[in-house]
């Protein structure tokens, strides 16, 4: 199926040009999306082109400036947050990135009723996290690893925790591993629905081993960055959950929420917290061996001022074929009765589907079913449940939004997006207003992205929020590559692939092939999305064929494929890339002497193992910031898929699956190894060990490091990186400069 045909006709050919590397590095063909910042059922805020914060009322059709660009500029604000009572706005400036989600910033509070900044009892700086209560204008914030509460922005703060200490005790914010591998947020505190209670996590990292690396900077001596970072098998953070009454915070102080007995009996994780009502909370816990998850519903006991989590309200989710959940264990979406909930987990056939849990998981009612997967529950209202899935036309790399009427029996299902802009839009997400009165659809492709506003009752399109007209016009004279998404059936395994073909692709000719791989557990690379990126350039200008293949271990095609890699990372992911390459060669248009593979992070690991597979298929390849041994990576991620690196568990495969163990096999390929020296995630150690093993084996290779760069290799490093990789590939494929 050709998803994005090149608009090339012979008459136009001479007026059209190929993509250039400069186009990609400059972001010339980047697209915009529009996510409304909903503040009610029919109102949203959005930052206008001239940087005013504007309120849009869908019902009246009118707009109102609520914060002028001058006010924003007066404190160099890059972000804002409106209090639910609409009395105040926080303005965020001095953004300073820490890890993937975390950052510190300076916060100013602006009073919307008098148009002035709040003076007196100003917030300290820099703040690690700040948020409004869901009702009114209480503030909770984290400063120097402790949590503070303000009843009103101008009030003096109440200090909730006192034991916070850098790199030791984290209150209300996650430590490194919880941020990256469990919560995927910069915060670890949660207001109850009406702001009565504040729940928070305390992470104790006292006994965690520390990763230390040099940050060179500009000084005479480099700084040393120290991060408590548990690698596979190491000591993990100790987590506790507390809840405090924010109306009378000093009355009884924070109350700890008990951990289910079956979880507390050995090492465990806290995975998420969901408030149900002001006096009911749902916590999810996970055993360190991540195939058992417990969802615990706890109630406030007024008489004792404590939280009670009865065993009858514990729901166990267990996987016998792999780990619990997909990438993460799914979170519940509670219904209006405040006890039953909807949740995505594997059905008896091994496909992730929506289930309705009223009393026990065993008695769960399956809401969706089929040989496809439900991916996200967006919203549950009194009469509808909105979710996304890849059901439509059996393409796992698509996302459509569905509505199930739960108010009627039997429930009826409607695809909201399937036929809206069928050629242009096959991959959607959605954003809902209060009570799903309205919603925005954001379509990511395969055509040019478009964001639209819809009536939540009728699904009628109200208006286009962003259609990327400028991008459309800019692409009119560009020779874009052709893209196709198809599948290979090999030994009862379906391998979906995306192939990116040069604009004047001719099946009778031979083309160099570049495999782009990620391949990590529960990932998906073959998606029906729009992108004009580096590989688009390689196809458009340099005439390469690029292929992406989703092999075993990838997501949204059932547990058989997903859990195939359980406890044996680095085997089937590599095999499936190799199998696909052989199939591509059979298609007749690939020059089998010019095949390369590249990947970043997990993809760097897979590309390294593929190059060292001894198949002779690959002439060259690139690994950017690769994992080289699972003993070097984070416990939470690694152990989920590999178990523990102990003799009585899975140490043997930990040792067998390293890149270093295959150093000899790099002798007959051209290998480019790249890593940032300040990579907090996949430590430089990984590439240092590969390099050492290659040197010890007397194998020649190429390498590039990026000083003081993290896992993202951002800024000027990005330009250098892609320029360098382009030269490497062109040399490998004997393409002239």
């Amino acid at each position: 199926i050709v998803l994005r045909p090149s608009r090339v006709h012979n008459s136009e050919e001479n007026t059209m040009r190929a993509l250039t590397l400069k186009d990609i590095l400059n972001g010339t063909f980047s697209y915009k999306t529009f996510f409304p910042n909903w503040i009610s059922g029919q109102e949203y805020l959005h930052q206008s082109a001239d940087n005013n914060i504007v309120l849009y009322n869908i019902e009246t059709g009118q707009s109102y400036t609520i914060l002028s660009n001058r006010t924003m500029k007066s404190v160099n604000a890059s972000n804002y947050g409106l209090s639910p009572d609409r009395q105040f706005v926080y303005l965020e400036s001095d953004y300073s990135k820490l890890w993937r989600y975390s950052y510190t910033a300076t916060y100013y509070i602006y009073d919307l009723s008098n148009g002035e900044f709040v003076r007196g009892n100003e917030l300290p700086r820099p703040i690690q996290y700040l948020c409004w209560s869901p009702v009114g204008s209480k503030l909770a914030y984290v400063y120097q690893n402790n949590i503070y509460l303000k009843q009103r922005p101008g009030d003096p703060p109440f200090q909730i925790t006192f034991n916070g200490r850098e790199n030791k005790i984290f209150n209300g914010i996650p430590d490194w591993v919880y941020e990256e591998e469990m919560l995927a947020t910069k915060y670890a505190l949660w207001w109850s629905p009406n702001g009565k209670f504040l729940a928070y996590a305390e992470f104790n990292d006292t006994d965690i081993p520390v990763i230390a690396y040099s940050y060179y900077g500009d000084e005479q001596y480099p700084r040393t960055i120290n991060i408590p970072y548990p690698k596979a098998g190491a000591k993990n953070p100790v987590v506790r959950i507390f809840i405090i009454d924010t109306t009378y915070p000093a009355y009884v102080g924070p109350q700890e929420v008990p951990v289910p007995a079956m979880i507390a009996s050995s090492d465990y994780y806290f995975s998420w917290l969901t408030w149900v009502t002001d006096e009911r909370v749902c916590l999810q816990w996970l055993k360190r061996v991540q195939n058992v998850s417990v969802l615990s519903i706890c109630d406030f006991r007024e008489d004792w001022q404590t939280w009670d989590c009865p065993k009858t309200q514990e729901h166990i989710e267990e996987s016998r074929t792999g780990w619990a959940g997909g990438f993460f264990v799914s979170t519940p979406v509670f219904s209006y009765d405040a006890i039953s909930y909807y949740k995505i987990f594997s059905d008896k056939d091994g496909y992730k589907h929506i289930h309705y849990i009223k009393d026990t998981v065993e008695n769960a009612i399956q809401i969706t079913s089929g040989k496809w997967e439900a991916i996200n529950i967006f919203r549950v209202t009194q009469d509808s449940l909105f979710y996304s899935s890849n059901e439509f036309e059996e393409y796992p790399g698509r996302r459509n939004i569905y509505r199930i009427s739960i108010g009627s029996y039997p429930p009826s299902k409607k695809c909201v997006t399937c036929h809206l802009r069928k050629e242009r839009c096959q991959y959607y997400t959605a954003s809902f207003s209060d009570y799903a009165k309205y919603y925005a659809l954001v379509c990511y492709g395969p055509g040019i992205p478009i964001s639209t506003l819809h009536d939540g009752r009728t699904d009628q399109e109200i208006k286009i929020l962003e259609e990327n007209k400028e991008l459309e016009n800019a692409l009119k004279n560009i020779q874009l590559p052709k893209e196709e998404i198809k599948k290979l059936e090999v030994d009862e395994i379906t391998l979906w692939y995306k192939m990116i073909l040069p604009p004047q692709f001719d099946r009778s000719k031979k083309y160099p092939l570049l495999i782009q791989v990620y391949g990590g557990p529960c990932s998906q690379s073959v998606r029906s999305v729009f992108a004009v990126n580096w590989i688009s350039y390689l196809a458009s200008k340099e005439g390469m064929v690029i292929a992406l293949v989703d092999g075993r271990g990838t997501a949204f095609q059932g547990d058989k494929l997903l859990y195939a890699v359980y406890r044996k990372l680095g085997v089937y992911e590599v095999e499936d890339q190799i199998t696909a390459v052989r199939k591509f060669i059979e298609m007749g248009f690939i020059d089998e002497k010019r095949i390369a593979i590249w990947g970043w992070s997990y993809g760097g690991y897979v590309s390294s193992l593929a190059l060292a597979s001894g198949t002779g298929l690959f002439k060259c390849g690139i690994a950017v910031a690769p994992v080289s041994s699972w003993e070097y990576y984070a416990s939470v991620y690694t152990e989920r898929f590999m178990g523990l690196p102990t003799k009585d568990d899975n140490l043997e495969h930990y040792k067998n699956s390293t890149v270093m163990a295959r150093a000899e096999y790099f002798r007959n390929v051209d290998y480019l190894l790249i890593h940032g020296t300040a990579d907090d995630n996949v430590h430089f150690q990984n590439s240092a060990q590969i390099a050492k093993a290659l040197v010890n084996a007397q194998v020649d290779f190429q390498a590039m490091w990026y000083s003081d760069q993290n896992h993202g290799l951002s800024g000027l490093s990005t330009n250098h990186l892609y320029t360098h990789m382009t030269h490497f590939l062109k040399q490998c494929f004997s393409l002239s400069d």
Partner: antibody, heavy 119, light 111 residues
Amino acid sequence: QVQLVQSGAEVKKPGASVKVSCKASGYTLTDYNMDWVRQAPGKSLEWIGDIYPNTGGTIYNQKFKGRVTMTIDKSTSTVYMELSSLRSEDTAVYYCTRFRGIHYAMDYWGQGTTVTVSS
Amino acid sequence: EIVLTQSPATLSLSPGERATLSCRASESVDNYGLSFINWFQQKPGQAPRLLIYGTSNRGSGIPARFSGSGSGTDFTLTISSLEPEDFAVYFCQQSNEVPYTFGGGTKVEIK
């Protein structure tokens, strides 16, 4: 300080049009919407409509649709309200009011312009 | 359109007394936890002046003796202790739905 200064009283014949101006000072015109409200002698207040100064986007009370037009001149920080096909029941004091959108509140009012429609 | 009914039409009180003014809407003016009911004071020959916005928030420079409350369809303006300058006409107004509408007014006069 915020000031909304309106044009002077008008006497018009039925069927004619009237254009009332409102000059804003003490704040940036484009930061707030402007609403118009009228008050017939001895009566309550009646909302006419609203204009968003950045784009000139308007919403009108259905009762006045087709007869009212609100415009803006950013260069002079002036907002105009024109009412056509006047009839005797349009006799009223017309007020411009600054509209604080986040609170849906008319927080500052002009002094009012008396429009008399009489044959 | 939403009709606002104010009562009483006239309230005769003495300075220092507590005044309670009522405003009833023909349908709920609640907007997801917020009620867009505003109160204005108008003296003869003058433009109205914003006293309370969003049901209970005092406008700029409005004394603390003025307070607002209510939700759904029933709203109240309270003047805790009448001052001589408080004798005027008071209007409630809703901004929850277009067209925005005003109540008929309550005249607070000296007894």
